[in-house]
């Protein structure tokens, strides 16, 4: 057999990506519900966990135990500014753990706490599964990438998430760097090129500079927006809505959680729709106190609401170029990343800003970043092919590295956007006579004191001989290999005295018991999972089997074909069967596949008596096979307000 | 007129397979769902599940999954339930039964004894 | 699973008295979309296989007398046998197919 392969992951803080390198080319592989990317959700109810679109259909439902948005907690502290922040606009708790967030849900009947690794480790889990299913086998080695300015803190907990998923972490990869990996692929050999790539997506915003010369790549600059995305403007399009439906109706719906959530779910689809149309209808039927909201937009006026956001998204861009040390004239490709880069607006703010320049749309914006994650997991494993066995990654400290001098100053040794490995090297000596060692205090962070950046480690460099103050010569050495690990020397020159410290940030990490413990309670969830996804598949082909017959007898195609007994058979039928899934959603899996095989005795036969002569089969997803056939449960696709 | 006709009474021992046939004549056998019932002497009634007589796919009762197995033969309209591993408890008349709203049309039930 | 309770475990009533059997559920066998009760009535006469008496709490089967009728919903149901014959002497059994199927322990009615 050949070589498991291993798989690149997009880990996005509202959706997930996965991808494979294999016979020559990528596949992004779409999950069970067709879709190429899955949202990173993960709910928890009184009788199951779900993760992925099955967690978001049903987040109005239950919003206080549905989790998303762990990238904006992971590897951060419960005190970091930007989680106290950001805290204020989640419907679930996060509490404070020794310092460490963790997510409180009620799941089971019982109080839960998970650290943002377990949530991050569950989407994982769900995206490594994905794989495996198109795969047809184990999946363990993996490429995950994370956005260009997480520190090392963050990229350690990311691929700790990933070790409680049962992955092998190949590499943390930058996202832009796996988005430009996607696109070199079939652009070496053009010299050297300059390459901006704008990142708008749910809700962060990247935006990055690289070099693309023959197959290498090099990070020059990263610049951006942690909260601007698409979520943004479809806020922006609710909030319009909710005006419109009090000037319609006299009524505000903005306190109605399910209403809000109903509105904010077909605003989304009018803002895709925009993307492609000049307008949008929205049809909503009883979104509040049973009043129907029906209505549309018109691109220009989305355009309007938004374009303050739309326009802010070139300050990144200047940005980038100032640190780049680039003028606009010297990019020489623009890379669109994320579903947002698709509003044709965006596109065109960009390209004129560029003075006309073409965009490079060849990449699906959505797949671009799990793209390069996969190829280069296919490198990391040793692919010869000769698409990829050229290329060298050239990755970049994201934040500067430094070291605390006399009254906190922060030092800087490897400036942020340095191409890693790197190694440098800097003399530094004592600050007062006869001192007899040095405390080396490691930090990373752009602040010119260190107080506002984050420590990562400290060592003490003893023994140094007595001598008045500046004379002693300290050697600091910073060396960042290709993964990022940072180890940091002291010699004094004098004796030859050395010192050191590798800096992997275990400091606020998961101890290797905690991750033994929640590899291990991730194997226990995915058990009942299983039994869950069962449930579940056994009600969706109930559900999908009930609206197929029930849509199909009442075809006007049919008139004249079928009688009134055995239309009304089939429609009572039908109908017993949906109104006791509405009040038995939580029903075994027996009892689901019972009611299907109930309402397949009485439709089969009616049905398939309407196609037998016709040709060929009855319509798609109805089961109309002769006896012995199929059950013909049709597609488990299902949309939940 | 719609009958329900099933085999004849069995003696087996412990450890023996049973095969009871249920044959319908007067209907469309197709066209609805045959259930099985169990009645233990002197006690009440058990349903053990049913066959979708149109897919052949069966449904046990939790109390029926294992050693029981429905079948059905659409050519010759009849259905079978087949016990294997029989023991002293599995002793009881076995009824068919066909369904559309309801148990509306039953077999004359079959008598099966298991004794050493 | 559901549990159907039946009550009285046996009954004996008079020649042309009425004869009341009640049926229990442990939960609600209404359904609201259909306004139904999936409970049905079944008679079996000794040596007899059973005999559908009365479908969705209150639908008599054809051929079954106007003396027998079914009332209820949710989880209370009754049968009742309005004026008792002979030939009504019978072990009676509930039945549930709001999910799956359960058959009640049955009631024997005797004539007094």
């Known amino acids: 057999m050949a070589k498991a392969a291993a798989i690149g992951i997009d880990l996005g803080t509202t959706y997930s990506c996965v991808g494979v390198f294999q016979h020559g080319k990528v596949e992004i592989i779409a999950n069970d519900q067709g879709n190429r990317t899955t949202p990173s959700y993960v709910a928890f109810t009184d009788t199951e966990r779900l993760i992925g679109d099955a967690a978001k259909n049903q987040v109005a439902l239950n919003p206080q135990n549905t989790v998303f948005d762990a990238k904006r907690l992971i590897g951060r502290k419960f005190g970091d500014p930007v989680v106290q922040s950001d805290m204020k606009h989640w419907p679930f708790q996060v509490i404070n753990d020794g310092d460490k967030p963790k997510v409180q849900v009620s799941y089971k009947g019982e109080t839960k706490a998970f650290y943002p690794e377990e949530i991050s480790s569950m989407v994982l889990t769900k995206m490594k599964e994905i794989a495996e299913a198109y795969l047809g086998y184990p999946v363990t080695n993996a490429v995950i990438t994370v956005p260009a300015y997480f520190n090392d803190s963050q990229r350690q907990a990311t691929k700790d998430a990933g070790v409680i998923a049962g992955l092998n972490v190949l590499r943390i990869i930058n996202e832009p760097t796996a988005a430009a990996i996607a696109y070199g692929l079939d652009r070496t050999g053009k010299g050297e090129r300059n390459v901006l790539i704008f990142d708008l997506g749910g809700g962060t915003f990247d935006v990055s500079i690289l070099t693309i010369d023959d197959g290498i790549f090099e990070v020059k600059a990263t610049a951006g927006d942690t909260h601007l995305g698409g979520e943004d403007f479809d806020n922006r399009l609710v909030n319009h809505f909710v005006e419109e439906f009090k000037r319609k109706h006299k009524k505000d719906i903005s306190q109605n959680k399910r209403a809000v959530r109903r509105l904010r779910t077909a605003c989304e689809r009018a803002k895709r729709t925009l993307s492609s149309s000049t307008q949008a209808s929205l049809e909503i039927d009883s979104l509040f106190e049973g009043i129907d909201f029906y209505t549309s937009i018109t691109r220009a006026r989305f355009e309007e609401l938004c374009s303050d956001l739309f326009r802010s998204t070139l300050e990144p861009v200047e940005k980038a170029l100032r640190d780049a040390k680039l003028d606009k004239a010297q990019i020489h490709d623009l890379v669109l990343v994320g579903g947002s880069t698709r509003i044709p607006k965006v596109q065109k703010l960009l390209q004129d800003f560029f003075n006309g320049r073409d965009l490079n749309k060849s990449i699906n914006p959505d797949e671009a970043v799990a793209y390069g994650a996969a190829v280069q997991a296919a490198i990391l494993m040793g692919d010869k092919s000769e698409n990829v066995q050229d290329l060298l990654l050239l990755d970049v400290a994201p934040l500067s590295l430094g070291l605390e001098t006399a009254g906190g100053v922060m030092t800087a040794l490897i400036k942020r956007n340095s191409t890693i490995p790197t190694k440098q090297t800097q003399i530094f000596t004592t600050y007062s006579d006869n001192q007899p060692g040095v405390l080396i205090q490691v930090y990373e962070g752009e602040r010119a004191m260190t107080k506002d950046n984050n420590l990562l480690g400290r060592f003490e460099l003893s023994g140094i001989p007595p001598a008045p103050r500046g004379v002693p010569q300290i050697e600091v050495t910073f060396d960042i290999d290709a993964n990022g690990i940072l180890n940091v020397t002291a010699t004094d020159k004098s004796t030859g005295k050395a010192n050191k410290i590798t800096i992997t940030n275990d400091k606020g990490r998961l101890s290797k018991e905690e991750i033994e413990r929640m590899v291990q309670e991730a194997e226990k969830y995915k058990a009942e999972d299983e039994v869950q996804r069962e449930r579940v598949s056994a009600k969706n082909a109930l559900e999908s089997y009930a609206f197929n017959m029930k849509s199909a007898v009442e075809d006007e195609g049919l008139k004249g074909k079928i009688s009134e007994a055995d239309k009304k058979k089939v429609l009572d039928k039908c109908q017993e069967v949906i109104s006791w899934l509405d009040a038995n959603t939580l029903a075994e899996k027996d009892e689901f596949e019972h009611k299907r095989k109930e309402l397949e005795q009485v439709c089969n036969p009616i049905i398939s008596g309407l196609y037998q002569g016709a040709g060929g089969p009855g319509p798609g997803g109805f089961g109309a096979q002769g006896p012995k056939g199929g059950s013909g449960s049709g597609p488990t696709i299902e949309e939940v307000d | 007129q719609i009958q329900l006709v099933q085999s004849g009474s069995e003696v087996k021992k412990p450890g023996a397979s049973v095969k009871v046939s249920c044959k319908a004549s007067g209907y469309t056998f197709t066209n609805y769902g045959m259930n099985w019932v169990r009645q233990a002497p002197g006690q009440g009634l058990e349903w053990m599940g049913w066959i979708n007589t149109y897919t052949g796919e069966p449904t046990y009762a939790d109390d029926f999954k294992g050693r029981f197995t429905f079948t059905t033969d659409t050519s010759t309209s009849t259905a079978y339930m087949d016990l294997r591993s029989l023991r002293s408890d599995d002793t009881a008349v076995y009824f068919c039964a066909r369904y559309d709203h309801a148990m509306d049309y039953w077999g004359q039930g079959t008598l099966v004894t298991v004794s050493s | 699973e559901i549990v159907l309770t039946q009550s009285p475990d046996s009954l004996s009533v008079s020649l042309g008295e009425r004869a009341t059997i009640k049926c229990k559920s442990s939960?609600?066998?209404?359904?609201?979309?259909?306004?139904?009760?999936?409970l049905a009535w079944y008679q079996q006469k000794a040596g007899q296989s059973p005999k559908l008496l009365i479908y969705w709490t209150s639908t008599r089967e054809s051929g079954v007398p106007d003396r027998f009728s079914g009332s209820g919903s949710g989880t209370d149901f009754t049968l009742t046998i309005d004026s008792l014959q002979t030939e009504d002497v019978a072990v009676y059994y509930c039945?549930?197919?709001?999910?799956?199927?359960?058959f009640g322990g049955g009631t024997k009615v005797e004539i007094k």
């Open positions: 039945k549930q197919s709001y999910t799956l199927y359960t």
């Open positions: 939960q609600s066998l209404l359904n609201s979309g259909t306004r139904k009760n999936y």
